[in-house]
């Protein structure tokens, strides 16, 4: 099942999704796309990275974090009610079967009719998981056994949404990526 | 325009392995965009997906052959194969090379078939 | 394993008419389905992707709908060389898997 992300008409929405590269520029190709992960690539490409750089974009998708040290969470920019739905996000790893593929769920609400308010309220910080649990528990970790250079991190999910952009930027910051081994 | 152009023996005999090679012409194979796969077809019949190796390495076999089959690249010759152990009768079949563009999935390029006969 | 079931088995018809062939999932492939055709002695040819999405240098009387579990390919007006075999085939969920085909016969 998804996990659920949320953000307001207008603000910006963050879809989290992240790895860790053997080397700082030991890439792999990276695709998001708008619908559920299908067998291959990613459905209604909307970003894409090869072994050295973004390669293909559309207007409102980017990649804020630095995605040579395996940050490849989409930002999607001023984001409508259109933008709800289902967002894949697969990390292309070479081996038999060894891609890695997350769905994450987005939904967005009206804005609030309130004055603008001083900073982002609603800002999608929960970070993606491997396995069920939730909660603010250790992170869960999963190591490729036949490709030992490339580790893949998952996050236990933030049950409560985030409504401070300081706390997601914090929470970034402090090492929720990890390198394992 | 990628062109596909397969090569490999019609008959192979029970308990052998299965090679077959398709050259890719038109493009290269290491370029990103392309995932070069196999397809059959037993006689008569329907198709039946077989596997893929991806520009960037990442390969899916069909479950049913996964323990039997191996697809790689050589990309010196700019070719990629499929070798397909232990076979029996009911691994002949039309098998066929193809590329699917991975950039929406709007053409893909096929060989000719190979007809593969098993039998001693 | 995801099945897909083609209706009908075979079709007749005449050049110049309308044909709609049915594809059906056993679960829902969202709109990752695609529409091959086939003549005998040759290779599948891609004519549709993603459900609805024409390939590239398909003529415009091809064309896909449906989404789900349910999918229809409409070839609107009957070419003489139109008349093969159509299978689907979804890459939803591996393993890829293609429906039975439907042959389409000249009447």
């Known amino acids: 099942s998804e996990v659920e992300y949320r953000a307001e008409v207008g603000q910006n929405a963050y879809l989290p999704c992240f790895y860790t590269p053997a080397a700082p520029g030991n890439l792999v190709p990276v695709c998001w796309g708008k619908g559920a992960c299908p067998v291959f690539e990613c459905g209604n490409v909307v970003l894409r990275t090869d072994e050295r750089d973004v390669n293909y974009w559309t207007s409102r998708y980017w990649l804020n974090g630095d995605f040579r040290k395996g940050d490849v969470s989409l930002t999607i920019e001023n984001v409508t009610l259109a933008d709800s739905g289902i967002y894949c996000c697969r990390i292309q790893i070479p081996g038999i079967m060894n891609d890695e593929k997350f769905n994450l769920k987005l939904v967005i609400k009206p804005a609030k009719v309130t004055p603008a308010p001083t900073r982002q309220r609603d800002f999608t910080a929960a970070f993606p998981r491997m396995l069920t649990t939730r909660g603010h528990g250790p992170a869960e970790t999963q190591t490729l056994g036949s490709l030992p250079d490339i580790n893949l991190t998952q996050i236990s999910t933030l049950a409560n949404e985030l409504r401070d952009s300081r706390l997601a930027n914090d929470l970034r910051d402090s090492g929720a990526t990890i390198r394992i081994g | 325009q990628v062109q596909l152009q397969q090569s490999g023996p019609g008959l192979v005999k029970p308990s052998q392995t299965l090679s077959l090679t398709c050259t890719v012409s038109g493009g290269s194979i290491s370029s990103g965009g392309y995932y070069w796969s196999w397809t059959r077809q037993h006689p008569g019949m329907g198709l039946e997906w077989i596997g893929y190796i991806s520009y960037s390495g990442s390969i899916y076999y069909t479950p049913s052959l996964k323990s039997r089959l191996t697809i790689s690249v050589d990309t010196s010759k700019n070719q990629f194969s499929l070798k397909l152990s232990s076979v029996t009768a009911a691994d002949t079949a039309v098998y066929y090379c193809?590329?699917?563009?991975?950039?929406?999935?709007?053409?893909?390029?096929w060989g000719q078939g190979t007809l593969v006969t098993v039998s001693s | 394993e995801i099945v897909l079931t083609q209706s009908p088995a075979t079709l007749s018809l005449s050049p110049g008419e309308r044909a709609t062939l049915s594809c059906r999932a056993s679960q829902s492939v969202s709109s990752y389905l695609a529409w091959y055709q086939q003549k005998p002695g040759q290779a599948p040819r891609l004519l549709i992707y993603?459900?609805?999405n024409r390939a590239t240098g398909i003529p415009a009387r091809f064309s896909g709908s449906g989404s789900g579990t349910d999918f229809t390919l409409t070839i609107s007006s009957l070419e003489p060389e139109d008349f093969a075999v159509y299978y689907c085939q979804q890459r939803s969920n591996w393993p890829l898997t293609f429906g039975g085909g439907t042959k389409v016969e000249i009447k």
């Open positions: 193809a590329s699917l563009d991975s950039w929406g999935s709007n053409r893909d390029y």
């Open positions: 993603d459900a609805s």
